[in-house]
């Protein structure tokens, strides 16, 4: 058993059919010795009498607010919440696996340049009795800060029968460099509770794997004299870093027919324009990447060939 | 080339070359096989190759006050992983490909690096640790190590050759 | 699927020599190292040496000047030949796939069902 | 070499219960956090049976009922639910250096 935060706690279940549980022992929070009785969430029964109880968690049943009371008067408040192990494993119920890039992906994160400002988001199918707390540090043996906001609900989805709900958490490190090489990973770290239950879940990367520029901006087409080219310009998104000469990013030049099937023209550039035919009822899309570090590309920006 | 003693080196050649091996190390990273030990690990791997950090001016206001601190950092990174992929790490058991571009990554590797410093003038280097891989399974998961590593600091090596090429040339 | 298989003389006189051949289907010898075990009645495994994809070769430094493993990678066989067998060399010998190197970090995945020799006069 | 020791060397448990086995390294076993330790189950007449590899992942076709933890030196081998298919011997191995080696086994028995 360990303390999530005052007055809360989680205890760690081996769960499997008759399993033992865990003997935990609850001390009420006073300087009273005499007459104090136990009770749990809204029950009036009385669990047990004097400072301590102690108690055998074995179930969701055996969680929830525990409460010593003296004469009527509340003295105070544990909440034991359970973190569930089954076959070597902690459960992972409250979030959904996002399967990308792997499976097991429970959390995601972005970042659009490498100020050290970054968001992670996660799926869940619970609409209730929901809660989330989010930590992050640089390294983990010996950690330098990273501040996160709260998780906020950031979209819902419907899918299938089921509502698919969005959560999302901005961080910012503390003291970002940009320039530097990378060598001790960020690590995200969100506690789940979802009624009597807790779960954790964990991040590692680098801000330089998780870069994902926004699209280029300002995409404009101009024609060329006596020809079916077009001079395709565009300028490096605002949210990149700058300055541009040490932050380069390289693009993609794409001609898309109308319809999917027809054949793509790709023109790859590290300039801000580009020459290319454009037929008719085609768009022309660009997008951006790290010039010298394979992480995604950004988003096309598009714009209609006429 | 660089000439020792604070004057610039050829910041375009440079440009060139370490946009080249961006390009080489990620072009190597998914042949060096099969790997799913990959995504596991630890922290203590990165301990052992040397980083471009942050004092290390290897910023666009560094470079500009004094460009040689990032260049002599550069250049000691370059000399330890070239010393890195010509090692049993790579050389031993399992055999890489006959066209794996590890052979082009190693000798683009030792290109940058005579670049910046020509014959006759010696920045100290960084001792490789002795990472004693015994086994291929430990060879391999070095592999992986070491070429993610390397496109992390060739990224940061090419950043600062672009800049210096665009805004510090003479 | 996946197949090791050996075959040995079974019986073999104090101070002679054991050829065991060991054939395997399912996967090619370029691609995976093999290992020999051997097991004594009613004992527990004892790791013999390993030839790699490449050809190379690790042994036990305790019977290592008594082993030698080899291969035929267009036959798909491997080979062990051990020399100066006493009655303690009785045992159960296994060939053994080593699981991908990128994956399984030296555990065997595949195991034959092994031959049996006994060292006796 | 690298001692690997088993215990305990039997263990009788009923059916429905937890089996716990534990394997303890003379050296540890990990290689830049990857633990080359690996359990196998080995039924009387038939060659061991790799269950799990790399401390905790379960081998393709074993029931999830069998799990692995562990790290460096300590490791433990843990079947839920014991069903009388798992009366087997278990044995430990690591692969982080020469010789590879293995544990003397722990037998497991039905109570």
């Known amino acids: 058993i360990w303390e999530l935060k005052k007055d809360v706690y989680v205890v760690e279940l081996d769960w499997y059919p008759d399993a033992p549980g865990e003997m935990v022992v609850l001390t009420c929070d006073t300087p009273e010795e005499d007459g104090i009785t136990w009770t749990l969430d809204q029950s009036s029964e009385v669990l047990g009498s004097g400072k301590t109880l102690t108690i055998q968690v074995k179930e969701f049943g055996d969680a929830g607010q525990y409460t010593c009371h003296k004469g009527g008067e509340v003295l105070s408040h544990s909440l034991l919440l359970l973190h569930k192990k089954e076959d070597g494993i902690w459960s992972t119920d409250i979030l959904k696996d996002q399967k990308e890039p792997k499976n097991k992906t429970f959390l995601r994160c972005e970042a659009k340049n490498y100020s050290g400002r970054f968001t992670c988001w996660w799926l869940t199918t619970i609409s209730t009795d929901l809660t989330f707390s989010v930590k992050s540090s640089r390294g983990s043996s010996d950690p330098q800060g990273v501040t996160c906001g709260a998780a906020t609900l950031s979209a819902e989805r419907v899918r299938g029968d089921n509502k698919e709900y969005e959560y999302s958490v901005e961080c910012q490190e503390d003291s970002a460099c940009p320039a530097a090489e990378e060598s001790l990973p960020i690590e995200v770290m969100v506690d789940a509770v979802h009624k009597l239950k807790y779960e954790n879940y964990t991040s590692s990367f680098f801000i330089r794997d998780i870069i994902k520029p926004d699209p280029p901006k300002n995409l404009q087409l101009k024609p060329l004299k006596n020809s079916r080219q077009v001079e395709v310009s565009w300028e490096y998104p605002d949210t990149w870093s700058t300055p541009h000469s040490y932050f380069s990013l390289t693009f993609c030049v794409q001609v898309q027919g109308k319809s999917k099937r027809e054949k793509k023209d790709r023109v790859f550039t590290d300039k801000t324009s580009a020459t290319v035919i454009c037929r008719k009822n085609a768009s022309i899309s660009v997008r951006a990447q790290d010039r010298y570090y394979s992480s995604s590309w950004s988003e096309w920006a598009s714009v209609p060939c006429s | 080339r660089a000439v020792p003693g604070g004057s610039s080196p050829a910041w375009t050649q440079c440009q060139q070359l370490s946009q080249k091996l961006c390009t080489l190390a990620w072009s190597a990273h998914p042949l060096v096989g099969h790997m799913d030990l990959r995504e596991e690990g630890d922290e203590e791997t990165t301990n052992d190759v040397p980083h471009i950090q942050c004092g290390d001016g290897c910023d666009p206001q560094g470079l500009r006050d004094n460009s040689q601190f990032c260049l002599q950092r550069i250049h000691q990174g370059l000399i330890f992983y070239e010393k890195l992929l010509g090692s049993d790490i790579f050389t031993g058991e399992p055999s890489l490909l006959p066209d794996s571009p590890v052979g082009q990554l190693h000798a683009s590797l030792l290109g940058l690096s005579q670049l910046l410093q020509p014959e006759g003038h010696h920045w100290e280097t960084q001792q490789i640790p002795s990472l004693s891989p015994s086994q291929p399974w430990q060879r391999l998961l070095l592999r992986f190590k070491i070429l993610r590593s390397l496109q992390a600091f060739v990224a940061v090596a090419a950043r600062v050759f672009a800049h210096g090429a665009a805004t510090l040339s003479p | 699927q996946v197949q090791l298989k050996e075959s040995g003389p079974g019986l073999v006189a104090p101070s002679q020599s054991l050829s065991i051949t060991c054939t395997v289907s399912g996967f090619s010898l370029t691609s995976y190292a093999i290992s020999w075990v051997r097991q004594p009645p009613g004992k527990g495994l004892e790791w013999l040496g390993v030839i790699w994809t490449g050809g190379g070769t690790n042994y036990n430094s305790g019977i290592k000047s008594r082993l030698t493993i080899s291969k035929d990678n267009s036959k798909s066989q491997v080979f062990l030949n051990m020399n100066s067998l006493q009655t303690e060399d009785t045992a159960r010998y296994y060939c053994?796939?080593?699981?991908?190197?990128?994956?399984?970090?030296?555990?065997?995945?595949?195991w034959g069902q092994g031959t049996s020799v006994t060292v006796s006069s | 070499d690298i001692v690997l020791t088993q215990s305990p060397a039997s263990l009788a448990v009923s059916l429905g219960q937890r089996a716990t086995i534990s394997c303890r390294a003379s050296?540890?076993?990990?290689?830049?956090?990857?633990?080359?330790m690996h359990w196998f189950q080995q039924k009387p007449g038939q060659p061991p049976k790799l269950l799990i590899y790399r401390a905790s992942n379960l081998e393709s076709g074993i029931p999830a009922r069998f799990s692995g933890s562990g790290s460096r030196t300590d490791f433990t081998l843990t079947i839920n639910r014991v069903e009388t298919d798992d009366v087997a011997t278990y044995y430990c191995?690591?692969?982080?250096?020469?010789?590879?080696?293995f544990g003397g086994g722990t037998k497991l028995e039905i109570k």
């Open positions: 050296e540890s076993v990990d290689y830049y956090g990857i633990s080359s």
């Open positions: 053994v796939r080593e699981g991908d190197y990128g994956s399984y970090a030296g555990a065997m995945d595949y």
């Open positions: 191995q690591q692969a982080n250096k020469d010789p590879y080696t």
